[in-house]
């Protein structure tokens, strides 16, 4: 009689993560008597995957009833496959021995490859805000995919970026892989509404790439421009001085009026107007009683924006001049303004 052969007909099997892998194995004879066991890998450290008679293998089921006397089909199914299950599986026939069963013949092995989807890309920006014209770095990470081949692209508002570096780890063979990419983005004043997108394409995604986004509103700081102007008012002895705070982002802003260097009032931007580009405008005014001053008054509008060092703009109020002839009227932007009399 011909010696028993262990046949594993599939050289390789490809399974998607989460699915069930079927590993086929048949024996050509019932002799010698002894069990079949499945292992992953070869050599002394091989991992036992299934033992017909002993051990706990909750993910493994047999394709046929191994207790049938004439059974020669030793195929198994492994459920809920993960990338960690990748490897070469051997169907091994043992013959009964004492004290331990003795390995008799092994199949040629079946290589199990696992296709695993990458995790949703996570995009993170710099820890601190930056101002326009500065270059900032964004990182994109995705994990757990297999096989290793993957494509990553960066976009800003739909326009593909070219200044980025990407690494896929580990470099050698692994059950699954991770990708890490860093892109450099130059900020502009119009970027409050901008988005940076990291797009990952992988064979498991069937042409429908995964995207991770970061809003530049979390990254950008647009410093305000200040303009201090003086408008006449009806009363002969009163002057209205306004401080226009324009094109700033984010909204966090504190304004202080100084009169000849002395703090007159501090307020926080509340009722702001939003520009189309996402930046904000705000205006504050002071109502100055000129008759209370003998000398010229230096009025300073000092703005602290988003915790940055204060910027200021000053206006010299000439007490001798007729108030109605000074300044230009820009009262159209006075919504949400504040009043203050100086006596």
């Amino acid at each position: 009689e011909e010696e028993l052969q262990v046949i594993q007909p599939d050289k390789s099997v490809l399974v998607a993560a989460g699915e069930t892998a079927t590993l086929r194995c048949t024996a050509t004879s019932l002799i010698p008597v002894g069990p079949i066991q499945w292992f992953r890998g070869a050599g002394p450290g091989r991992e036992l995957i299934y033992n017909q008679k002993e051990g706990h293998f909750p993910r493994v089921t047999t394709v046929s009833d191994l207790t049938k006397r004439n059974n020669m089909d030793f195929s198994i199914r492994i459920g809920n496959i993960t990338p960690a299950d990748a490897g070469t599986y051997y169907c091994v026939k043992f013959r009964k021995g004492s004290p331990d069963d003795v390995e008799f013949k092994s199949g040629a092995g079946t290589e199990l490859s696992v296709r695993a989807k990458p995790s949703a890309p996570v995009v993170s920006g710099p820890a601190a805000r930056a101002t326009p014209q500065h270059t900032v770095s964004f990182t994109c990470e995705s994990h757990g995919f297999s096989p290793r081949d993957i494509t990553l692209k960066w976009f800003k508002n739909g326009n593909e970026l070219s200044d980025f570096q990407t690494n896929v780890d580990p470099v050698g063979e692994s059950v699954s892989y991770s990708i890490h990419s860093t892109a450099k983005v130059v900020l502009t004043r119009e970027d409050v509404h901008s988005q940076v997108i990291c797009e990952v394409a992988h064979v498991t995604l069937q042409g429908d790439p995964l995207r991770g986004t970061a809003n530049l509103s979390e990254t950008i700081r647009v410093p305000p421009t200040l303009e201090v102007t003086q408008q006449p008012v009806r009363a002969e002895n009163q002057v209205n001085v306004t401080c226009q705070v324009r094109k700033f982002y984010p909204q966090r802003l504190q304004l202080t009026w100084l009169e000849n260097g002395n703090v007159s009032r501090t307020e926080t931007a509340s009722t702001v107007t939003e520009n189309k580009d996402g930046t904000y405008n705000w205006m504050s005014w002071l109502l100055v009683n000129v008759s209370a001053h003998r000398d010229d008054v230096k009025l300073t509008c000092q703005v602290e924006h988003d915790g940055q060092p204060a910027v200021s703009k000053s206006h010299d109020l000439k007490v001798s001049a007729h108030p109605k002839e000074q300044g230009s009227n820009t009262a159209a932007e006075n919504t949400g303004s504040n009043e203050r009399n100086i006596y």
Epitope: P44, Q52, K53, E54, G55, H56, T67
Partner: antibody, heavy 114, light 108 residues
């Protein structure tokens, strides 16, 4: 539901023989080995031996070899463990265990006393 | 025969503490064949960990197993009142199958 139901407690004299049964249900009896494990009072677990119900093949712990006999009756899905030449140190709880090591019988107390 | 030596024999801890139990084999055991059990008084042992590091069905995630070769560890990350029991390691890599002597985890 998988169950291994063992026979009741036994009191035996030194030199006698005890035979404990373990009736299996809820799984294919011939699928896996049935093991027997001893636990003396306040002591640890000791593997005694196992049987393959499919063909009656047995393995024993040399410590018990000449005194232990493990058998099965596949018609009733029952495994048996017979321990002969009993001595006081055989006073213990005896468990039958399915080959997956998940399913254990409730244990059978054997007291050897003169 | 492969002798499994468990240490310590007794571990006195309070609920919420971390328990680390050791099992050392006299010769190398492939991880696939190393199991851990919990036993409470008057009850049969219960399988906790199979293949050195896999959690058996219904076992809380605070239990974990690790190790390879001759050194294996069972860890209980934060002891619950119901975890105070005796724990055994077990090898079925070669005959005769053997168990460790057990570690009793008791309330301090």
């Amino acid at each position: 539901e998988v169950q291994l139901v063992q026979s009741g407690a036994e009191v035996k004299k030194p030199g006698a023989t005890v035979k404990i049964s373990c009736k299996a249900s809820g799984f294919n009896f011939e699928d896996t080995y049935i093991h027997w494990v001893q636990q003396a009072p306040g002591k640890g677990l000791e593997w005694m031996g196992r049987i393959d119900p499919a063909d009656g093949d047995t393995k024993h712990n040399p410590k018990f070899h000449d005194r232990v006999t493990i058998t099965v009756d596949t018609s009733t899905n029952t495994a048996y463990m017979e321990l002969s030449s009993l001595r006081s140190e055989d006073t213990a709880v005896y468990y039958c265990v399915r080959g997956n090591y998940v399913n254990w019988g409730q244990g059978t107390t054997v007291t050897v006393s003169s | 025969e492969i002798v499994l030596t468990q240490s310590p024999a007794t571990l006195s801890l309070s609920p919420g503490e971390r328990a680390t139990l050791s099992c050392r084999a006299s010769s190398s055991v492939t991880s696939s064949y190393l199991y851990w059990y919990q036993q409470k008084p008057g009850q049969a042992p219960r399988l906790l960990i199979y293949s050195a590091s896999n959690l058996a069905s219904g076992i809380p995630a605070r239990f974990s197993g690790s190790g390879s070769g001759t050194d294996f560890t069972l860890t209980i990350s934060s002891l619950e009142p119901e975890d105070f029991a005796v724990y055994y390691c077990h090898q079925w890599y070669s005959y005769p199958r053997t168990f460790g002597g057990g570690t009793k985890v008791e309330i301090k």
